[in-house]
């Protein structure tokens, strides 16, 4: 008889999840010489150990510590790029500006990017049918806790001037409930981080408004300043031109504004 399986509101584990994680790990360690020492089988075992056989609404940051330990990596000062609700552009940027790094350019972020996973209490099976939804089911689910854990660590290790890309097309450009607003902002270390520079990315439509004056940006500035970190803000009025000018900084059109 088929076993009864908990039905969650979210989509199930990404198909071929173990193979995908292992393959990504191998690829990453091949491309990044400083991570060649990493044993990908151990990484997968630690990943699996964080959620397999556990009730998927009761996952803790502690569950991911063995994985975090194996994936320890440092970003040079001034080279951390955080983002909120504008992942694609942030990734396009670091693909061009190769010396800057988002969380997804690091091993653990790279392994899990765009994937979903969960297990079941007391079985070694992965649940491919459904996983808990953050809103409808629970916040302490395997995926949410993973991102909270690695985001916290990523912010804690940042130093120098930290950059963050924010989506100017959202009603809340800075959202206190986003991972950036609820985790990363509060885990930047004032003794290591001199400043946070926000880049507010305007939508495709042309606009002259200074979105750095938005009330939510003022709220971000207040939070950051209270933590004794300086705050700067820049409008990126033309994201397409911005990327083009990162690729070809000597282009004559890049002397005028972006």
């Amino acid at each position: 008889l088929p076993r009864w399986r908990q039905q969650w509101s979210g989509s199930g584990t990404t198909s071929r999840f173990p193979e995908t994680v292992l393959a990504r790990c191998v690829k990453y360690t091949e491309v990044h010489p400083e991570m060649r020492h990493v044993d990908c089988q151990s990484v997968w075992d630690a990943f699996k150990g964080a959620f397999i056989s556990k009730y998927p609404c009761n996952i803790t940051e502690e569950d991911y510590q063995p994985l975090v330990k194996l994936g320890t990596q440092t970003v040079p000062c001034n080279k951390t790029l955080l983002w909120s609700r504008i992942k694609d552009l942030a990734h396009q940027f670091t693909q061009v500006q190769r010396d800057m790094f988002t969380l997804e350019d690091m091993l653990l972020g790279y392994l899990a990017d765009d994937l979903t996973w969960c297990g079941e209490f007391n079985t070694f099976e992965i649940n491919y049918q459904s996983c808990p939804d953050w809103r409808k089911d629970c916040s302490n689910n395997p995926v949410s806790v993973f991102w909270k854990t690695v985001s916290r660590r990523f912010a804690e290790t940042a130093c120098g001037v930290v950059h963050v890309m924010l989506n100017g097309s959202r009603s809340k450009i800075f959202d206190k409930n986003s991972t950036f607003g609820s985790v990363e902002v509060h885990n930047l270390q004032p003794e290591k981080v001199q400043a946070l520079e926000a880049w507010v990315i305007h939508g495709g439509r042309e606009d002259s408004r200074d979105l750095c004056q938005d009330p939510t940006i003022k709220e971000l500035e207040s939070i950051i300043s209270k933590r004794n970190i300086r705050f700067f803000c820049k409008n990126i009025y033309r994201p397409d031109k911005f990327l083009q000018c990162v690729k070809n900084p000597e282009d004559s059109s890049c002397l005028s504004g972006i």
Epitope: R170, E206, S208, R209, Y237
Partner: antibody, heavy 119, light 112 residues
Framework: QVQLQQSVSELRSPGSSVKLSCKDF?????????MSWVRQKPGHGFEWIGD????????FYGEKFEDKAKLDADTVSNTAYLELTSLSSEDSAIYYC???????????WGQGTLVAVSA | DIVMTQTPLSLPVGLGDQASISCRSS???????????LHWYLQKPGQSPKLLIY???NRFSGVPDRFSGSGSGTDFTLKISRVEAEDLGVYFC?????????FGGGTKLEIK
């Protein structure tokens, strides 16, 4: 053709409030275009009150109007609203709504609503 | 706020003549995105303003080519090459480079 249709003239007494409406007949463009409100007082020229981006409710106010005006928009009826509070004779003017044609350029203007404040 | 100063206040012209209106801003209107947001409007008696020229020199749709705009930084000019009767009214310049957006005091174009 008429694109922005504003409410009729309003006569108000000092200290009261008034809510003006501006219906946009281009339902495709309305949600994603900033709608500005501008007032024209005889001998004072035009003053920009503020604007709203209806789909996300983002609002900018001219500093002078932050405590005077309240902007709002309804994307179901494609209507923008301007509420003026604590009216005085100084607020007597023609109030225009104006939608962007391109980014940050007021291309399409309503016919205006005359607000007269008098005891 | 940016102050927009228009000259002259009144401009009497003959039909078929050229007319020229000047607009000066209290600070540069060159925006950090590379554009200059200086625009010209015409308001006829009893009507709402109509956009003529946007971003210094671009004619808005349906605007005749006898209207042209030029300038940069803080100094701008609207030219009407051959004035027609339907061109009479008050011309306003406006800037939307910096909030709050501001308007010139207007130039009344009238028949000589």
């Amino acid at each position: 053709q008429v694109q922005l249709q504003q409410s009729v003239s309003e006569l108000r007494s000092p200290g009261s409030s008034v809510k003006l409406s501006c219906k946009d007949f281009d339902s495709e463009v309305f949600p994603t275009s900033y709608m500005s409100w501008v007032r024209q007082k005889p001998g004072h020229g035009f003053e920009w009150i503020g604007d709203i981006l209806p789909n996300i409710g983002r609002i900018f106010y001219g500093e002078k109007f932050e405590d005077k005006a309240k902007l709002d928009a309804d994307t179901v009826s494609n209507t923008a609203y301007l509420e003026l509070t604590s009216l005085s004779s100084e607020d007597s003017a023609i109030y225009y709504c104006a939608r962007e044609a391109y980014g940050s350029i007021l291309g399409y203007w309503g016919q205006g609503t005359l607000v007269a404040v008098s005891a | 706020d940016i102050v927009m100063t228009q000259t002259p206040l009144s401009l009497p012209v003959g039909l078929g003549d050229q007319a020229s209106i000047s607009c000066r801003s209290s600070q540069s209107l060159l925006h950090s995105n590379g554009n200059t947001y200086l625009h010209w409007y015409l308001q006829k008696p009893g009507q709402s303003p109509k956009l003529l020229i946007y971003k210094v020199s671009n004619r808005f749709s349906g605007v005749p080519d006898r209207f042209s705009g030029s300038g940069s930084g803080t100094d701008f000019t609207l030219k009407i090459s051959r004035v027609e009767a339907e061109d009479l009214g008050v011309y306003f310049c406006s800037q939307s480079s910096h909030l709050p957006w501001t308007f010139g005091g207007g130039t009344k174009l009238e028949i000589k």
